[in-house]
Amino acid sequence: AITEAREEAKPYPLFPGPFPGSLQTDHTPLLSLPHASGYQPALMFSPTQPGRPHTGNVAIPQVTSVESKPLPPLAFKHTVGHIILSEHKGVKFNCSISVPNIYQDTTISWWKDGKELLGAHHAITQFYPDDEVTAIIASFSITSVQRSDNGSYICKMKINNEEIVSDPIYIEVQGLPHFTKQPESMNVTRNTAFNLTCQAVGPPEPVNIFWVQNSSRVNEQPEKSPSVLTVPGLTEMAVFSCEAHNDKGLTVSKGVQINIKAIPSPPTEVSIRNSTAHSILISWVPGFDGYSPFRNCSIQVKEADPLSNGSVMIFNTSALPHLYQIKQLQALANYSIGVSCMNEIGWSAVSPWILASTTEGAPSVAPLNVTVFLNESSDNVDIRWMKPPTKQQDGELVGYRISHVWQSAGISKELLEEVGQNGSRARISVQVHNATCTVRIAAVTRGGVGPFSDPVKIFIPAHGWVDYAPSSTPAPGNADPVLII
């Protein structure tokens, strides 16, 4: 009778230890459950020791000892006869024989289904000589068995031109069905048909498939693997799996969730990253995408001033990177900002609105109608101007900066004066006579210094000149400031 060793039984001593290349270093026992890493511990079958020779192919040596006693017949010891194991597991089996030391150059070869196994296998023959006999143990290991490893394995030993053959060791690679294709998670449009595929193989074959939806079988009659399930459409999320059955039992695939695409949830946590006078950088956390990738987002901006006309500015942007710089805003203004994003199904609701403010900026225009004239009696230059329009001040005026440059006979000197925000005139002392004074004025806010006005020049005569007239910025369209003396 064939001795059979199944994975769930221990008919022979089992030697533990994973095959090299596995992640294990602790060499756990063979018959433990499969490891999370996917490594299957090996089945290893020892020679029976000391063991009883079988009565199969026996070589009866013709050599006699000194006392002329014939030597006992040589035969391989019995070992396991039939190994059934699952695909991808490791297995090791061996042949053992004790050979009198008078024999030299004994070699053992492994054969499978009548063909000698050469190379590409882990086969080792070990020799343990004693006083009179040498124990020879030939071990054959397969790290990860495949269906192609099924078959009958024997050892052959040539000795004295005789061939000793072991009993066969039958390797049967089989087990529960193994999935080659499992259903995949999908996001589908409501009430739209879709397909799921499941494929599993033995051995043993055939493998039959049952489909399961939300823990209930879909098909009463099994389908032969591979199986395609056509679902006419869903109105709500469902979980599908498939069961693969063969004579060894049942394997259940992973459960996959089929989701129904919907409009996204509104973005959350809209926040201000940075504010300048004319721009606001915002970020947001996208809401749930509704099982459909975001396509783009819309930033809605309203002036928060109750006197504003309530118009909404809309800025469209890509869905990534959840960051947008809103430009072309007014300085020192309050805005309400909301974000909405869309997927293939539609737009989300708008996020909760947040309030944001632009900062003060430097004025965007210079003071207007700059006029300069000489007050000779007091040896001063009087300067007058008009403040920039309120909308273009971009903040609260804190004053003005006056630049006056004095040029005479190749010498040039620039002086700066700061004046308060009240009023629109200033007086500066004459620095140099018989010289040209060039005046420019800029408005100042806490946001910075605005642009300087166009230069206005006035000639300061030597002492004793009487006639003078004011100098002023040119009317629009004139190329150069007018100099009147």
Partner: antibody, heavy 122, light 106 residues
Amino acid sequence: QLQLQESGPGLVKPSETLSLTCAVSGYSISSGNYWGWIRQSPGKGLEWIGSVDHSGSTYYSPSLKSRVTISVDTSKNQFSLKLNSVTAADTADYYCARNTMIRGVMDWFDPWGQGTLVTVSS
Amino acid sequence: AIQLTQSPSSLSASVGDRVTITCRASQGISSALAWYQQKPGKAPKVLIYDASSLESGVPSRFSGSGSGTDFTLTISSLQPEDFATYYCQQFRSYPTFGQGTKVEIK
């Protein structure tokens, strides 16, 4: 994980018997494998002494066979070495180790105990 | 018994050097050979088995080659922690070890 720990007297008189025990933890000796003893004389190389399996089956180094006994006690998860008629030449670090059985019956040694020094002196 | 002869018995090398140690068996042992590293006061640790298979967790700078009677252990770029004694061991028959090769700092 599997660990091995040698124990026994560090000093033995000439002609007496050296006795060491190796306690195995993190793994059951009954699960299989051969379990071996290796020694290393001061400043010298490594010498395999012998190995035993869970059933008590032994292999001994031909050069030490006449003086060595290795036994196993699966109930205590330990195995032992006895080396009789010791001389100063037996002074060495003695290591216990598991003989892996990945390829054959007795392959390489992994892991090893940390070793214990035994001095033979009167 | 199968004897293993290692050469050289010692060598001096610098960090970054390529180091080669050989092990010769007195008779053919196929690929039934392992290499160990031993540091002072410590037990040997397996580096290579089956003549050329790298033990899990051993740096890839270690490699083994050979079959039959001649075997080689190579350290491609010696690191400070590699200064130690290296042994070969055959498992074709009763285990025997080479006499060791000590790798010292030059």
